[in-house]
């Protein structure tokens, strides 16, 4: 059912990394436009991306209001140039997205090793605490501030001269590891939320090796 010559959106998909959240859908419009609505389970629907010919809508501003809520979005289809027209049910054609809970589902972005510092046979590796678009009291929160101890980092490290990897874990953004004196090491980190059932791990950070500019060496 629905308005003549309009088709319902389909393949509604959430694309979300570190809470930056975009809804995508198909098809590319032909003689129609779209409006998106988003709501928590309260049913207080908010309209976004009015009468757009895009097939994506940035919903970050809405979901960051409460990342632990579960959201649903719906995409309405209207004939181009006649957006007041409705279908036989007295409503425009629409389709619902899957449910989306940002805290449980947003992808963890690729982390970055901020620095590493060697003091004797110990190396302190620091992971950059990326700022998110989640706000509290007008300030943007970091990933650590949002997830707290739910977020851990895994460090992979190995001697530059060999391929055998070791691992370490932390629920802060810092590692303190033992190394062999006189050896150069390479490092990569991964963000992990162990309690999740989906999207548990980020991709690995770029590899950083001792003897390059991010490091500092002290006897």
């Amino acid at each position: 059912s629905g308005t003549t010559n309009t088709v319902a959106a389909y393949n509604l998909t959430w694309k979300s990394t570190n809470f930056k959240t975009i809804l995508e859908w198909e098809p590319k419009p032909v003689n129609q436009v779209y409006t998106v609505q988003i709501s928590t389970k309260s049913g207080d629907w908010k309209s976004k991306c009015f009468y757009t010919t895009d097939t994506e809508c940035d919903l970050t501003d809405e979901i960051v209001k409460d990342v632990k809520q579960t959201y649903l979005a719906r995409v309405f289809s209207y004939p181009a140039g006649n957006v007041e027209s409705t279908g036989s049910a007295g409503e425009p054609l629409y389709e619902n997205s899957p449910e989306f809970t940002p805290y449980l589902e947003t992808n963890l972005g690729q982390p970055t090793i901020q620095s590493f510092e060697q003091v004797g046979t110990k190396v302190n590796v620091t992971v950059e605490d990326e700022r998110t678009l989640v706000r509290k009291n007008g300030t943007f929160l970091t990933l650590r501030q949002v997830f707290g101890k739910d977020l851990i980092y895994t460090l992979y490290y190995w001697k530059s001269s060999s391929s055998g990897k070791k691992t370490a874990k932390t629920n802060t953004n810092e590692f303190l590891i033992d190394v062999d004196k006189g050896e150069n090491y390479c490092f990569s980190v991964q963000a992990v939320i162990p309690s999740r059932t989906v999207n548990r791990k980020s991709t690995d950070s770029p590899v950083e090796c001792m003897g390059q500019e991010k490091g500092e060496f002290r006897e």
Epitope: G2, A8, S39, S42, G43, W45, Q69, A89
Partner: antibody, heavy 118, light 107 residues
């Protein structure tokens, strides 16, 4: 555990009024849309009205528009249905239900019987 | 208004049977359909939403399928506690409407 407890039903004469209440517990009340559904004796289910979590959006079935008013007090975790100009055909068990996104009905109260008769 | 038609109106079956109840909408409702179970003198209970999503706590022998206008509720192996009346409901557009119910009785 989600609990919904209706009250306020009873016997009323045609043209009279009743106010039903539904006390909610076990969940964050303001985070959910809520609905009223009724069931006449020996009959099927009929959706009556829904309200969004904020109370800003309300919806009614045609047969009760202008006579019934749905409302909520989020500070008291309570849903209401004010029923005026009652008719014999409004006789039913009235259920309150939690309604995620204002869509389906995932938790129901035990119901309260409203009888409209002279 | 969207009319919802359930069939059959009543059904006799035995424990262990596989049972299918159908629901047809008078116009397309995508997957915006729910199923409920009601036992005598009790409140309805949610079984399925979004045509095929199982409500939390509902046994996996219940399943739903369909999209557009035709939907089914299937009970893979009837248990004694499943004898009840089943209703479908569309939430595509207001006023939301229910099917007339299917009474599942013991054979």
């Amino acid at each position: 555990e989600v609990q919904l407890l209706e009250s306020g039903g009873g016997l009323v004469q045609p043209g009279g009024s009743l106010r039903l209440s539904c006390a909610a517990s076990g969940f964050t009340f303001s985070n959910y849309a809520m609905s009223w559904v009724r069931q006449a004796p020996g009959k099927g289910l009929e959706w009556v009205s829904s309200i969004s979590g904020s109370g800003d959006y309300t919806y009614y079935t045609d047969s009760v528009k202008g006579r019934f008013t749905i409302s909520r007090d989020n500070s008291k975790n309570t849903l209401y249905l004010q029923m005026n100009s009652l008719r014999a055909e409004d006789t039913a068990v009235y259920y309150c239900a939690r309604s995620p996104w204002g869509y389906y009905l995932d938790s129901w109260g035990q119901g309260t019987l409203v009888t409209v008769s002279s | 208004d969207i009319q919802m038609t359930q069939s059959p109106p009543s059904l006799s079956a035995s424990a262990g049977d596989r049972v299918t109840i159908t629901c047809r909408a008078s116009q397309g409702i995508s997957s915006r359909l729910a199923w409920y179970q009601q036992k005598p003198e009790k409140a309805p209970k949610s079984l399925i939403y979004a045509a095929s999503s199982l409500q939390s706590g509902v046994p996996s022998r219940f399943s739903g399928s369909g999209s557009g206008t035709d939907f089914t509720l299937t009970i893979s192996s009837l248990q004694p506690e499943d004898f009840a009346t089943y209703y479908c409901q569309q939430y595509n557009s207001y006023p939301y409407t229910f099917g007339q119910g299917t009474k599942l009785e013991i054979k």
